[in-house]
């Protein structure tokens, strides 16, 4: 039924409606940092350059369907995708000496989710299952955050919007059975 076209497991389905996973603690409590959507960066940055775009943390609105195994949300949800280069990065000569290349140096700032919101969605499932309500966690804002090398390994994996996120504490839903009868009528067998 074309499910894979909608597949994107970046949004986390919260296992129980009563549970609401807390976002990770702030990695840097810098109150003077500009709002992410304004393309801000930490002031007095040791590697500051005149090109603001190097440090922009953009909040891109992304509309898509939430999926949970073979199930798909009845309607698309709109959430934010964090994008952009927070820096700092140095422009260094490459090994051959023909031009420049970016290489991370010093503290590592990344544009990652800052706040989350919970939203209920209706999941539609094939194979004779009834639609059901689920609460999902969606990105509500982005921020340039200072990450240690340790955080690089954990935080960025957790927030990658391209990689499929493992569903913690959920058993995989069994695949829908194949239909046996005439397809035109069978679409109503659900």
């Amino acid at each position: 039924q074309g499910w894979q076209a909608f597949k994107n497991d970046a949004t986390e389905i919260i296992p129980e409606l009563g549970e609401y996973p807390e976002p990770p603690p702030e990695l840097e409590n810098n109150k003077t940092m500009n709002r992410a959507e304004n393309g801000g960066r930490p002031p007095h940055h040791p590697f500051e350059t005149k090109d603001v775009s190097e440090y922009s943390c953009r909040e891109l609105h992304f509309t898509r369907y939430v999926t949970d195994g073979p199930c798909r949300s009845a309607k698309p949800v709109t959430e934010l995708v964090c994008s952009g280069q927070c820096g700092p990065a140095r422009l260094l000569p490459n090994a051959i000496g023909r031009g420049k290349w970016w290489r991370p140096s010093g503290p590592d700032f990344r544009c990652i989710p800052d706040r989350y919101r919970a939203q209920r969605v209706q999941l539609l499932c094939p194979g004779g299952e009834a639609p059901r309500a689920r609460k999902v966690r969606l990105v509500a804002s982005c921020k340039c955050k200072r990450l240690t090398r340790f955080h690089n390994q954990s935080e960025l994996k957790d927030f990658g919007t391209e990689a499929a996120r493992p569903q913690k504490g959920r058993k995989p839903r069994p695949r829908a059975r194949s239909a046996k009868a005439n397809q035109a009528e069978l679409e109503n067998a659900y």
Epitope: A74, P131, A133
Partner: antibody
């Protein structure tokens, strides 16, 4: 045309059992999800149970879980609701309703045809 | 489960527009259906999937759904529209169907 006719209602004592039937005609019964919905006298609608076309999936309202069992016999075009351990609060008109899938993935699975209902009275 | 809340009654003059609301937590993300029930009769589906009319339902019936409120709108209300109306949706966390409370529409 689509027709749903419920039967099997009546007066039963608390703790007793009753089996409701819903005879379907005018459509390919096995291809449709079916539901039971009830309505207590003077009250609103309350969904009771759901069964998929091939009986592989059944769902129940919390208020009837463990006491009621939904089933179907596609060869007879008939839907059933076995009601055990009946209580006074189960007194209602019971409707069977066909559930139709609109568009991709069935949309919201609305109940597009209803029977006229059968009255179940639980009283001593 | 999400609770769907409807006003107990709505009154409208003939020819005017009647609006019946159905509110619930983020109900705009769910498909909502509307049923009409006249005294002594079985319910009839008048709107499915927020804003679609089944065949045989007059064009004066329409629906909308966004945010926390779904609305059934009856334009140019007629005396025969006097009935009880229910919104409904598969809004339970374990596959249950939820009906809103009854709204009695009175055509003055």
């Amino acid at each position: 045309q689509v027709q749903l006719v419920e039967s099997g209602g009546g007066l039963v004592q608390p703790g007793g059992s009753l089996r409701l039937s819903c005879a379907a005609s005018g459509f390919t019964f096995s291809s449709y999800v079916m539901n039971w919905v009830r309505q207590a006298p003077g009250k609103g609608l309350e969904w009771v149970s759901f069964i998929s076309g091939d009986s592989s999936n059944t769902y129940y309202a919390d208020s009837v879980k463990g006491r009621f069992t939904i089933s179907r016999d596609n060869s007879k075009n008939t839907l059933y609701l076995q009601m055990n351990s009946l209580r006074a609060e189960d007194t209602a008109v019971y409707y069977c309703a066909r559930t139709f899938m609109h568009g991709h993935l069935g949309g919201g699975l609305s109940m597009d045809f209803w029977g006229q209902g059968t009255l179940v009275t639980v009283s001593s | 489960d999400i609770e769907l809340t409807q006003p107990p009654s709505v009154s409208v003059a003939p020819g005017q527009t009647a609006r019946i609301s159905c509110s619930g937590d983020n109900i705009g993300s769910f498909y909502v259906h509307w049923y009409q029930q006249k005294p002594g009769q079985a319910p009839v589906l008048v709107i499915y999937d927020d804003n679609n009319r089944p065949s045989g339902i007059p064009e004066r019936f329409s629906g909308s759904n966004s945010g926390n409120t779904a609305t059934l709108t009856i334009s140019g209300t007629q005396a025969e529209d006097e009935a009880d109306y229910y919104c409904g949706s598969w809004a339970g966390s374990s596959g249950s169907y939820v009906f809103g409370g009854r709204t009695k529409l009175t055509v003055l």
